[in-house]
Interface confidence: low
């Protein structure tokens, strides 16, 4: 062991200087004192491998992994991270120790993992292993649950491949429509992975962990229900499992159910049937169609037929990648100050989207509701009649969608005035955007009715404040006008507002606000 070098591994934490994020490793950072990582030879390892204590880093934190090598002569080195070789420039400190550094700026999940440092000195070769992980929840995932048939049993297993291990629950409801809302007394929850009672009206499985809750509904065709006006549609991605349940109730057992895909019976092993008598002695049959991992050729019309009920179909569409279909053209609305109004986005998406509404850099929760035609809708009503730009943003892991809305509130202008040494300016919001007049107040015109025809410069909509347009008008003053009162008036279809300004020395001198409606 005499030939082995003395190795010291340290972690240096940096306080991020936001202005220099993403710069090279030499960017100026405020550093905290180095922490020793207790580098030690790894037992039972092939070759000379040193291992540092696992480094836990907060997301967005910046760190340096540093190795100090007390070995004579030159050293050469190579960092390897996730199969990729990274440049390595050793230097020597005042104590003539070799120093090798790896700077990780603004830690993200992709930078977590094993950092290997291969060092070659004149005496020996050795490897140093750093394991870098993100502290706490950032490695957590929450995936939508899916169904599997339990081996040798008529039961469904609900699976959600999530970290940390999620709590899985079945959410069952035996009534129709609105009464199956989450907190309704008609809803029964079972905190278990396996479900044997598969005859209910509405069956969902939900998984929850620290990141929230995700649910999947068991797609069902009920032959006793009036078919929807539009054909129900089920989207799946290649490789996902397909489950469709067909349910029918009849006065006795003398009926059977069958599944067909595009008029061809499903293969043996891709369906199973269950039946039971209900409390009123009618027979309930359910027939599941399932594919453990769908391919493109599983797309088509799945039809459930019964000898005693009209058949019903669903269109199953298999896509390579998730999607969000909606019109992304921006929409402008103008409403009165007390008019009730909601923004609305109608979209079709798979997998289900997560969405937000944003106004003035603030985000608002986004609710979505399924419609009968397979589309969903998200509405936003909480605008509090504030004019400006509203943004709807949706994503689902495979696709992103953004739609802009502009809300204009019809109201009469309100004028703000200011004056400088050389000009007087008035600005106004109000919608529709106002037009301007300037009047001079003089002995001849004490009521300020004398038009100022020259030196006026109108700028419409030159400034956007969160999407709200502002109109302004500027009067360039001549020497002859100094000392006079002038009046600027903004008018639109809802009224007029004026402001009187003394053309004097620099500084705002608006006074006497007239308001003529």
């Amino acid at each position: 062991n005499q030939d082995l070098p003395v190795i010291k591994c340290v972690l240096i934490n940096h306080k991020n200087n936001d202005s220099s994020v993403g710069k090279s490793s030499s960017y100026p950072m405020v550093s905290e004192s180095p922490e020793d990582l207790g580098c030690a030879l790894r037992p039972q390892s092939a070759g000379t491998v040193y291992e540092a204590a696992t480094v836990e880093v907060d997301v967005s934190a910046s760190i340096t992994l540093q190795v100090l090598v007390d070995t004579p002569g030159n050293i050469s080195c190579l960092w390897v991270f996730k199969h990729s070789s990274l440049n390595c420039q050793p230097h020597f400190d005042v104590q003539n120790r070799g120093v090798v550094s790896m700077v990780i700026l603004k830690m993200t999940e992709t930078q977590a993992g094993e950092y290997l440092l291969f060092i070659q000195s004149e005496a020996t070769n050795y490897t140093i292993l750093f394991t870098v992980s993100i502290r706490n929840t950032l490695l957590f995932t929450l995936r939508r649950p899916y169904f599997r048939k339990m081996e040798n049993q008529d039961a469904l297993v609900c699976i959600s491949e999530s970290v940390p291990e999620p709590i899985v629950e079945w959410v069952l409801c035996d009534s129709q429509g609105e009464s199956c809302k989450e907190e309704s007394p008609a809803v029964v929850k079972k905190e278990e992975k396996v479900l044997h009672e598969l005859f209910g009206t509405d069956i969902r499985c939900c998984a929850r962990n620290e990141l929230g809750r995700e649910c999947t509904r068991l797609f069902t065709i009920d032959l006793n229900q009036t078919p929807q006006t539009t054909l129900p549609q089920l989207f799946l991605k290649v490789g996902e499992p397909l489950w469709i349940r067909c349910k029918a109730v009849h006065v006795n057992h003398g009926f059977g159910l069958t599944w067909e895909l595009e008029n061809k019976a499903l293969e043996e092993g891709s369906y199973f049937e269950m039946s039971t008598y209900s409390t009123n002695r009618t027979m309930i049959r359910i027939l599941f169609a399932f594919v453990s991992s769908v391919a493109r050729n599983d797309t088509g019309y799945y039809t459930c037929s019964s000898s005693k009920h009209p058949s019903q179909s669903a269109l199953v569409t298999i896509v390579e990648k998730g999607f969000i279909n909606a019109t992304n053209s921006s929409e402008d609305y103008e409403i009165d100050q007390y008019e009730e109004f909601c923004f609305s986005v109608r979209f079709k998406a798979y997998p289900q989207i997560r969405c937000t509404w944003t106004f003035s850099r603030k985000s608002f929760p986004c609710e979505q509701k399924g419609l009968d035609d397979g589309y969903s809708v998200s509405k936003f009503c909480n605008h509090k009649h504030q004019p400006g730009e509203y943004i709807f943003h949706a994503e689902n892991g495979d696709a992103q969608f953004t739609k802009m809305f502009t809300l204009n509130i019809r109201r009469k202008p309100q004028v703000l005035a200011e004056a400088s040494a050389s000009q007087a300016s008035c600005s106004s919001d109000g919608y529709p955007l106002p037009s301007w007049t300037w009047k001079k107040c003089s002995d001849k015109s004490p009521n300020c009715t004398e038009d100022i025809p020259e030196g006026v410069w109108n700028r419409k909509a030159n400034r956007k404040v969160f999407g709200q347009w502002v109109s302004s008008s500027t009067l360039n003053m001549s020497e002859a006008m100094k000392g006079f009162l002038v009046k600027c008036c903004a008018y639109n279809s809802l009224g007029t507002s004026c402001e009187t300004i003394l053309l004097n020395s620099p500084g705002p001198f608006p006074f006497i606000q007239d308001s003529i409606s």
Epitope: K82, H83, S84, S85
Partner: antibody, heavy 124, light 107 residues
């Protein structure tokens, strides 16, 4: 379905630069933990791994050839390009590209799909 | 670099025979090993990954075993379509390295 297709010159003169393209379909390097390797096989000889690239642009090269190789991907992430400088007759081989898939639990599946290969002859 | 030594370099066998091919790594590679089959003029095809897991669609007469440095590929009952060259690949450390192949010929 997943396919990889190699293309490039069939004949290259010594000292020239060889550029090979692997065109991907059925998958792309958009997806996290997806990668493509280049492998070659001189006539009647063994397989030799040359280089690979991952979707996040991580790259690795054969130790003996790394000074002559460059691997890259195009902006559409459906093509991977390998360039080899200063070719020599010993570089005559069938060049293959093959897919790598990285799985969530941390292991990687190497070369589940291969291209059909393109024979490159280095001769004056 | 890790060397992968395959043996034998060739073998003759008859249909129905049990065939065993060995791959030895110059240092431990855990189970980071795959087996590939190549027929003349064709690209290799993956048979086994993670030392012992059978690739989907590959007949169950193929099996893999081993861990660390010693690995074997076994064909329990050789079929006419199995006459080919077989390669092992280690992907434990870079550079990735292949064995130099075992050619299985008809006796």
């Amino acid at each position: 379905q997943v396919t990889l297709k190699e293309s490039g010159p069939t004949l290259v003169k010594p000292t020239e630069t060889l550029t090979l393209t692997c065109t991907l379909s059925g998958f792309s390097l958009n997806n996290a933990r997806m990668g493509v390797s280049w492998i070659r096989q001189p006539p009647g000889k063994c397989l030799e791994w040359l280089a690979h690239i991952f979707s996040n642009d991580e790259k690795s090269y054969s130790t003996s050839l790394k000074n002559r190789l460059t691997i890259s991907k195009d902006s559409s992430k459906t093509q991977v390009v390998l360039t080899m400088t200063n070719v020599d007759p010993v570089d005559t081989a069938t060049y293959y590209c093959a897919r790598i898939v990285g799985y969530g639990s941390g292991w990687y599946g190497f070369f589940d799909y291969w291209g059909q290969g393109t024979l490159v002859t280095v001769s004056s | 670099d890790i060397q992968m030594t395959q043996s034998p370099s060739s073998l003759s066998a008859s249909v129905g025979d049990r065939v065993t091919i060995t791959c030895r790594a110059s240092q431990g590679i855990r189970n980071d090993l795959g087996w590939y089959q190549q027929k003349p003029g064709k690209a290799p095809k993956r048979l086994i990954y993670a030392a012992s897991t059978l690739q989907s669609g590959v007949p169950s007469r193929f099996s893999g075993s081993g861990s660390g440095t010693e690995f074997t590929l076994t064909i329990s009952s050789l079929q006419p379509e199995d006459f080919a060259t077989y390669y092992c690949l280690q992907h434990n450390s870079y550079p990735l390295t292949f064995g130099c192949g075992t050619k299985v010929e008809i006796k």
